[in-house]
């Protein structure tokens, strides 16, 4: 049996051979898993417990958002002596157990990632039968979903004093920087307006006064790519047209 010294004054990787001490409950998860939207990700989770060779019924659970109280996204149960954990819940059918709970591994695979999946996840194991015990990771693992920018809305709206304003909303991770370009806005590009604001993965930028007819283009860019969309203003028609 190999045990790691946990005296912080000593090298954590030093190992010594010992007779096997009683294990305590602990759960080990990485700080973060990063993956791109549309891809799959593995959320690793391993655990130790004090019940030697536990072979009774067990339940593996993953929840999102917060420990102990967040909504469950996955749950499976294994009968006494069984290595098969039968799935009882898999939110949208996108979650499946990759690890083997009988071998202290609760690792979860998440398919078809979306930006909305970017949150913290917490693994939990419950023993039933002869032993009633349970344990859940306290800090969880953060799933960091990255995505190239996508402009999800661009529009021209009436503003004060018969003027028009334009709004552009984009999503992405890292949150994209937005820039407007158009007639009389300078060299084909404009700095992100001061009214630009972010909410989660959404970023909105407003062009408060469209003073000239023509094409106004919103560009969203982050380290993974860029996206453009345009609106057209024709005030002499008494209306505005939009094209993306």
């Amino acid at each position: 049996f190999v045990r790691t010294k946990i005296d912080t004054t000593e090298n954590l990787l030093n190992t010594e051979v010992h007779s096997s001490p009683a294990q305590r409950w602990s759960m080990q998860v990485p700080a973060e898993v990063s993956a791109a939207a549309g891809d799959a990700a593995v959320l690793p989770c391993t655990f130790t417990h004090p019940h030697r060779h536990y072979d009774g019924p067990l339940t593996a659970i993953w929840r999102a958002g917060e420990p102990y109280a967040g909504p469950q996204v996955f749950r499976c149960a294994a009968a006494r002596g069984s290595e098969l954990c039968q799935t009882a819940l898999s939110l949208h059918g996108r979650f499946r157990l990759l690890g083997n709970p009988r071998r202290n591994d609760l690792s979860l695979r998440v398919e078809r990632l979306a930006l909305a999946d970017d949150r913290r996840y917490f693994c939990r194991v419950e023993f039933a039968g002869d032993v009633h015990d349970r344990y859940e990771s306290r800090h969880g693992v953060r799933l960091h979903v990255t995505a190239a920018p996508r402009i999800i809305n661009i529009s021209v709206l009436p503003g004060p004093a018969h003027a028009f304003r334009a709004l552009c909303t984009a999503e992405g991770e890292p949150p994209p920087a937005l820039a407007w370009s158009g007639p009389a806005l300078g060299n084909g590009s404009a700095a992100v307006p001061s009214s630009g604001q972010g909410h989660g993965h959404l970023v909105t930028a407003e062009l408060p006064a469209l003073n000239h007819d023509g094409r106004y283009t919103c560009t969203a860019a982050n380290s993974l790519g860029r996206s453009e969309a345009s609106v057209y203003l024709f005030r002499f028609h008494g209306a505005s047209g939009a094209s993306t």
Epitope: F1, V2, R3, T4, I6, L12, L13, T15, Q23, S26, Q28, V29, P30, A31, E32, V33, S34, V42, P44, T46, T48, L98, G99, N100, R103, N104, D105, S107, H139, H144
Partner: antibody, heavy 124, light 113 residues
């Protein structure tokens, strides 16, 4: 002492597969993750993924998904990495490396022991 | 993925002098839950596999000479060799293990001037 001994050099044609072995000794094989890292000629280090020898759970870097398979045989304390549909840019030295102690509370997943490396050349 | 960028790409230092290698991560690798930096340093000599030198950004692996030290937090880290020895000629890599997939810096080649 901890030792990781890898299989010998391989020369493969594009489209073929290669399977590299890594025999561990000097520690309890199922207590630690086993990582695979590759290094193209004159280039840096690239993490490919890991296998948990205790549970057989794997985690692959996205760029190798669908092409890499990591397995283990606990009876002989050996980990394997198979890479399929080989391309010329897969030419590299492939290393196995011992990773985190499964029972340690913090996620200390550094690679504290390395195999000697297996040279894989992909050429038509 | 977290991008690790080392500087300089190569470095020539006289024997007995101090060598300093920098590593910058594109996002913080400091975990607020335990206040630890998930960063390691490796040394790779020609024709050999890498060797772990430092983890948690500043903890020396057993058997590593105390002339090697690591410092930094968040996104900026430094490996320092206080008095360069001939056997320290190698390529040095930083690696983050905060976020999966794990990533390495491109390496810094250290030579003797």
């Amino acid at each position: 002492q901890v030792q990781l001994v890898q299989s010998g050099a391989e020369v493969k044609k594009p489209g073929a597969s290669v399977k590299v072995s890594c025999k561990a000794s000097g520690y309890t094989f199922t207590d630690y993750y086993m990582h695979w890292v590759r290094q193209a000629p004159g280039q840096g280090l690239e993490w490919m993924g890991w296998i948990n020898p205790n549970s057989d759970g794997t985690n692959y870097a996205q760029r190798f998904q669908g092409r890499v398979t990591m397995t283990r045989d606990t009876s002989i304390s050996t980990a394997y990495m198979e890479l399929s549909r080989l391309r010329s840019d897969d030419t590299a030295v492939y290393y196995c490396a011992r990773g985190r102690l499964l029972r340690f509370f913090d996620w200390l997943d550094v690679m504290d022991a390395w195999g000697q490396g297996t040279s894989v050349t992909v050429s038509s | 993925d977290i991008v690790m960028t080392q500087s300089p790409d190569s470095l020539a230092v006289s024997l007995g002098e101090r060598a300093t290698i920098n590593c910058k991560s594109s996002r913080s690798v400091l975990y607020s839950s335990n206040n630890k930096n998930y960063l390691a340093w490796y040394q790779q000599k020609p024709g050999q596999p890498p060797k772990l030198l430092i983890y948690w950004a500043s903890t020396r692996e057993s058997g590593v000479p105390d002339r090697f030290s690591g410092s930094g937090s968040g996104t900026d880290f430094t490996l320092t060799i206080s008095s360069l020895q001939a056997e320290d000629v190698a390529v040095y890599y930083c690696q983050q293990y905060y976020s999966i997939p794990y990533t390495f810096g491109q390496g810094t080649k250290l030579e003797i001037k």
